[in-house]
């Protein structure tokens, strides 16, 4: 026989066949070679990877007396008990000279009752909300027809007549079970049963009803909850931190929020003990016997400003000749907003009250004119925010810089700014 091109041609004269059967089947794959000279070792590949621990036997039969005559080599791979892990493409590999030769492939697969590649999974869905379930099964033998069941009731008249891989459910109002049956020529396999738990829909239209410096009243519209009445709603409030910044729809707040429960109805809740003039984020979820709805997106809200809760402190007022020097410190009590400034009022015993807006300064020099006959001159100071004035300080008497010194008071203040507001005295 001509041998000129033998090195280029595959030495294989037999390739692995196909094994298709049920789990537990025993089968044999074979490769057959005819080679000249020293017979090579046959390696088995599954899906392109060498099988290191293959249960294989290699038999070599010489076809002549001479070592350089042809040899027949038969390698048999035994599959003792067919499992899913055995499935794949099988080939033989030999090294001859400086060349690798790979046999044509054979295939091992399972045949029997359908085998599920995908089964319906337990999940939660909002009431009356569409969702999909998936089920996928394969043979062989093909075809595999699916039949979906809801609460053990078939959703089609026969396998293959209804939805197949994907079941679209337009919505549920009660917790239900779903499974699928896979039918082929060998019989029927039933998938696991998935429980679809119906939760309330996400509340809608979370909004502010009223605002006070330390209190917010919020309301929302509950979502549908199927046949299960809502038992309560949960509201979370979170101080807005500019550094963190809660994004709308962020699944979890960056720090522990304030959590409050509201009996329902009404779908309304008063949040108290808040900081004035402070940004918050709030969200709400409602719960039935089946579990909680998803949270609404975080809604940014803000408490309004309040008036300062206390007067400025450490007020001192001293008179030195025709000048009076008054200074004070910021109220220690919460300002409940942005401090816009201070108002100062002073009055002598028999003179009208004078009201001044000092702005944000914490001291003022008053130019006094007079003969010193104005007696019992007192000064009061109040802080104010956009919401209004805080409480006035107690009247502070103007003390003489030097005892006995007095000046006539013809014009009490040299320059006064017109009061922005008219305030009653105490």
């Amino acid at each position: 026989a001509p041998r000129g091109t033998q090195a280029e041609e595959s030495p294989f004269v037999g390739n692995p066949g196909n094994i298709t059967g049920a789990r537990g089947l025993t089968g044999t794959l074979r490769c057959q070679l005819q080679v000249q000279g020293e017979p090579p070792e046959v390696h088995w590949l599954r899906d392109g990877q060498i099988l290191e621990l293959a249960d294989s036997t290699q038999t070599q039969v010489p076809l002549g007396e001479d070592e350089q005559d042809d040899w027949i080599v038969v390698s048999q791979l035994r599959i003792a008990s067919l499992q899913l892990s055995d499935a794949g493409q099988y080939q033989c590999l030999v090294f001859l000279g400086h060349q690798n030769f790979v046999s044509q492939p054979g295939y091992v697969g399972l045949e029997g009752l359908p085998y599920f590649l995908e089964e319906p999974e337990d999940r939660t869905v909002a009431a009356n909300t569409p969702f999909n379930l998936s089920c996928q099964a394969q043979g062989p033998p093909e075809p595999v027809d699916l039949l979906w069941l809801q609460d053990a009731v078939p959703l089609a008249t026969a396998p293959g007549h209804g939805p197949q891989r994907n079941l679209h459910v337009p919505g549920l109002n009660k917790t239900s079970s779903f499974s699928c049956e896979a039918h082929n020529a060998k019989g029927v396999t039933t998938s696991r049963t998935a429980t679809i738990t119906v939760l309330p829909q996400q509340p809608r239209n979370l909004h502010l009803v009223s605002r006070q410096p330390t209190e917010l009243e919020v309301a929302w519209t509950p979502g549908l909850s199927g046949i299960y009445p809502l038992t309560h709603c949960t509201l979370q409030a979170m101080l807005s931190d500019n550094e963190v910044g809660i994004q709308a729809g962020e699944p979890d707040p960056p720090e522990e929020p304030l959590t409050l429960q509201a009996s329902v109805p009404p779908h309304q809740l008063r949040l108290g003990s808040l900081h004035p003039h402070t940004p918050y984020h709030i969200r709400v979820a409602c719960t039935s016997s089946q579990g909680p709805s998803s949270w609404t997106h975080w809604l940014p809200v803000e408490t309004p400003e309040g008036v300062p809760l206390g007067p400025p402190e450490n007020i001192s007022a001293t008179r030195n000749g025709s000048q009076a020097f008054v200074h004070w410190q910021e109220p220690p009590a919460p300002l409940q907003g942005t401090l816009l400034g201070y108002r100062l009022a002073y009055q002598g015993q028999d003179t009208p009250e004078v009201l001044m807006d000092i702005g944000l300064r914490q001291e003022v020099t008053l130019e006094l004119q007079g003969d010193g006959s104005v007696s019992n001159l007192t000064v009061c100071v109040a802080a104010y925010t956009a919401a209004g004035d805080g409480p006035w300080s107690l009247p502070v008497p103007l003390e003489a810089w030097r005892p006995g010194q007095a000046q006539p008071v013809h014009q009490l203040v040299k320059e006064t700014s017109a009061p922005a507001f008219s305030w009653p005295w105490w």
Partner: antibody
Framework: EVKLVESGGGLVQPGGSLNLSCAAS????????MSWVRQTPEKRLEWVAF????????YYPDTVKGRFTFSRDNARNTLYLQMSSLNSEDTAMYFC?????????????WGQGTSVTVSS | DIVMTQSHKFMSTSVGDRVSITCKAS??????VAWYQQKPGQSPKLLIY???TRHTGVPDRFTGSGSGTDYTLTISSVQAEDLALYFC?????????FGAGTKLELK
Amino acid sequence: EVKLVESGGGLVQPGGSLNLSCAASGFTFSSYSMSWVRQTPEKRLEWVAFISNGGGRTYYPDTVKGRFTFSRDNARNTLYLQMSSLNSEDTAMYFCARGTTESYYAMDYWGQGTSVTVSS
Amino acid sequence: DIVMTQSHKFMSTSVGDRVSITCKASQDVITAVAWYQQKPGQSPKLLIYWASTRHTGVPDRFTGSGSGTDYTLTISSVQAEDLALYFCQQHLSTPLTFGAGTKLELK
């Protein structure tokens, strides 16, 4: 459908030559090894020749080695068996047959045969 | 050369019977045995290869078995259309060799 059609048989005198052909269709011819097998008037089957799918390997039994040449034209899907120095022992129905994928030496499809008679 | 021996030239059977046709190789052929069926005026048809692998389209009443040197073709329930000539062949190595054939006929 796999189809193999032999032709070229006939009556030939001892010592003469004959060329047989086999036209293949219905499968990827170039992927399969092929054989010629003959059946004697006594109905015995005898393997005559083997050729690999690419044509690079040919095997013959000693009874025909040196007298028969097996070749193939993959472009034309055709096999050729050139027979020379024919004798009465070569009288038979000649079949071309396709080797199986799992063993090229087992034959899964056979033609209907062409008759060769060597007689004076 | 490997000699394949079919000891029964003829076998008598009835429709519905179970019948076994045997073949013996002169040496271990590592299950490389094929079985062919030939009906009058037709070419041989492959039934079994690698001793037990049924060829595509062959009815499952035909089964092959054996190892080493001894091989058997069994027809579990003979049908009228099974009456034919059956050959074994070793497909281990060249030269390829056939048995002389067993003719299955009605009793």
